[in-house]
Interface confidence: medium
């Protein structure tokens, strides 16, 4: 008997064909012998199934010899033995009904479990095979587990329903929501204004929530929350922010924080939270702030970092267009009786400058200018 | 939600062949059957055959009787659509179309322009 | 082969304007009449099947009737993205044939 596998939902057409090429009489039976169509002369006839208003046939290629059954809206009890009866002769179709749903929302938080959930027929023994997006691919049998989602996770997964060495595919598109990046660094000299963006990596129509900014300067003991705000259909309104620093929000997406001056009490590292409306969890991204200031005091010629530097990064101080006079890992240098001329200060990653400071030291009968 | 997806624009010589293809996505490849229309400049829309979905049996309109062929991949959830001994008047656009049965053709390809050209 | 006869070839109608657009079969085909929307460039588009159907997704002010020889397809209240060339189609039997299209243009 042939098998066919059809999608819960969907809609399947089941073959019939008679040697005559011509339009005769044919029935369309299930397996407890219920009527589900048939014809009478050139007229659709219905029984009195389960089928009845989702059962068609193609009555164009009645007069070719083919009596199709077409079931719309498929459901998993539509799974059964279906039986064509013409010119004498009994065509019998298995045909089994899958369905594959995500039994969580498909939008799920950065690091939250998915879990699929395959509906089948009693008596059918299916395996199934999904693919993510980023082509690991899961097997499982009635349900299918994937633990830590990640941004990469999301987009349109690819399950494939094995039975009877037949398959059937299923699409379900997953989105994760996240930040684009798990977390950011700014490097800044000291007074300049300073931009925190903090980019979706998902888009949705309707995006409602609460937010929360919080922040470990460098210097300070503990930390403290800058900003809170609210987010209604993807506009920001700012609930509450400190009076130092005085921060300031962009009312659209993507969020986005202006810090006034770089200063280095300001400094460290932040974490901004995002709830979501009818999600469990909480989106993070975390912000680092490094701040740079150069010096010169008397005959000393001075230049810090503040906030969170990797080990590895270098700071120097060099006259223009000549080597390096101090280079270090570590957070300040300096130059006792600098020469007269532009020195920079540069923090540096294997090579690459992070960010720079000018300082113009002026023969010793005047006072340092900073451009 | 099915979505079907035909190959690029083909410009063939008179007596040339031409293969159109046509992708299915988002439902169950071997579940419905898909017609074969086509449209020439400014004309109407004529029916050229269908194939039908799990046997990959054909019923082709008698003009197109032995000129056309119509095959299907369900590997790669394809159905194509050869037409051979081209003449000018085979200049068309190309549409695939998921044929529900009597409740029409529900769902369309985006078309592929055929030019015959000496 | 059926044939399919629509009239008129071509109307003009204004925004708001009810529109009635008829086929005939040269032979009964029952209810097995569909109607078809295409505009420029694009492909059709499914309105109505088995003569009074309305696809899903498609707006309540087009309508179908008709049975055995005379269709009708109605536009109730005329909306501008409502101009476009309309098609009826019989699956009574094969081959599957269409009317010639009716174009609706703005007046």
């Known amino acids: 008997k042939k098998v066919v596998l059809g999608k819960k939902g969907d809609t399947v057409e089941l073959t019939c064909t008679a040697s005559q090429k011509k339009s005769i009489q044919f029935h369309w039976k299930n397996s407890n012998q219920i009527k589900i169509l048939g014809n009478q002369g050139s007229f659709l006839t219905k029984g009195p199934s389960k089928l009845n208003d989702r059962a068609d046939s193609r009555r164009s290629l009645w007069d070719q010899g083919n009596f199709p059954l077409i079931i719309k809206n498929l459901k998993i009890e539509d799974s059964d033995t279906y039986i064509c009866e013409v010119e004498d002769q009994k065509e019998e179709v298995q045909l089994l009904v899958f369905g594959l749903t995500a039994n969580s929302d498909t939008h799920l938080l950065q690091g939250q479990s998915l879990t699929l959930t395959l509906e089948s027929p009693p008596g059918s023994s299916p395996s199934v095979q999904c693919r993510s997006p980023r082509g690991k691919n899961i097997q499982g049998g009635k349900t299918l587990s994937v633990s830590q989602l990640e941004l990469q996770d999301s987009g349109t997964w690819t399950c494939t329903v094995l039975q009877n060495q037949k398959k059937v595919e299923f699409k379900i598109d997953i989105v994760v929501l996240a930040f684009q990046k798990a977390s950011s660094i700014v490097y800044k000299k000291e007074g300049e204004q300073v931009e925190f963006s903090f980019p979706l990596a998902f888009t949705v129509e309707k995006l409602t929530g609460s937010g929360e900014l919080w922040w470990q300067a460098e210097r300070a003991s503990s930390s403290k929350s800058w900003i809170t705000f609210d987010l209604k259909n993807k506009e920001v309104s700012v609930k509450r922010v400190t009076q130092d620093p005085k921060l300031q929000m962009g009312k659209k997406l993507p969020l986005h924080l202006t810090l006034p001056q770089a200063l280095p009490q300001y400094a460290g590292s932040g974490n901004l939270t995002l709830a979501l409306e009818a999600k469990t969890g909480k989106l993070h991204q975390e912000v680092n702030l490094v701040v740079m200031r150069a010096t010169q005091l008397q005959k000393n010629l001075t230049c810090e970092v503040w906030g969170p530097t990797s080990p590895k990064l270098m700071l120097s101080l060099k006259l223009e267009n000549k080597e390096a006079k101090v280079s270090k890992r570590e957070k300040a240098v300096w130059v006792l009786n600098p020469e007269a001329g532009m020195w920079q200060c540069l923090l540096s990653d294997s090579g690459q400058v992070l960010l720079e400071s000018n300082i113009k030291v002026l023969p010793t009968w005047s006072t340092p200018v900073q451009p | 939600q099915v979505q079907l997806v035909q190959s690029g624009a083909e410009v063939k010589k008179p007596g040339a062949s031409v293969k159109v293809s046509c992708k299915a996505s988002g439902g169950t490849f071997s579940s419905y059957a898909i017609s074969w229309v086509r449209q020439a400049p400014g004309q109407g829309l004529e029916w050229m055959g269908i194939i039908n979905p799990s046997g990959g049996s054909t019923s082709n309109a008698q003009k197109f009787q032995g000129r056309v062929t119509m095959t299907r991949d369900t590997s790669t959830s394809t159905v194509y659509m050869e037409l051979s001994s081209l003449r000018s008047e085979d200049t068309a656009v190309y549409y695939c179309?998921?044929?529900?049965?009597?409740?029409?053709?529900?769902?369309w390809g985006q078309g592929t322009l055929v030019t015959v050209s000496s | 082969d059926i044939q399919m006869t629509q009239s008129p070839s071509s109307l003009s109608a204004s925004v708001g304007d009810r529109v009635t657009i008829t086929c005939r079969a040269s032979q009964s085909i029952d209810s097995y009449l569909n109607w078809y929307q295409q505009k420029p460039g694009k492909a059709p588009k499914l309105l109505i099947y088995k003569a009074s159907t309305l696809e899903s997704g498609v707006p309540s002010r087009f309508s179908g009737s008709g049975s055995g020889t005379d269709f009708t397809l109605t536009i109730s209240s005329l909306q501008p993205e409502d101009f476009a060339t309309y098609y009826c189609q019989q699956s009574y039997s094969a081959p599957l044939t269409f009317g010639g299209g009716t174009k609706v243009e703005i007046k």
């Open positions: 179309a998921r044929d529900l049965g009597d409740t029409a053709m529900d769902g």
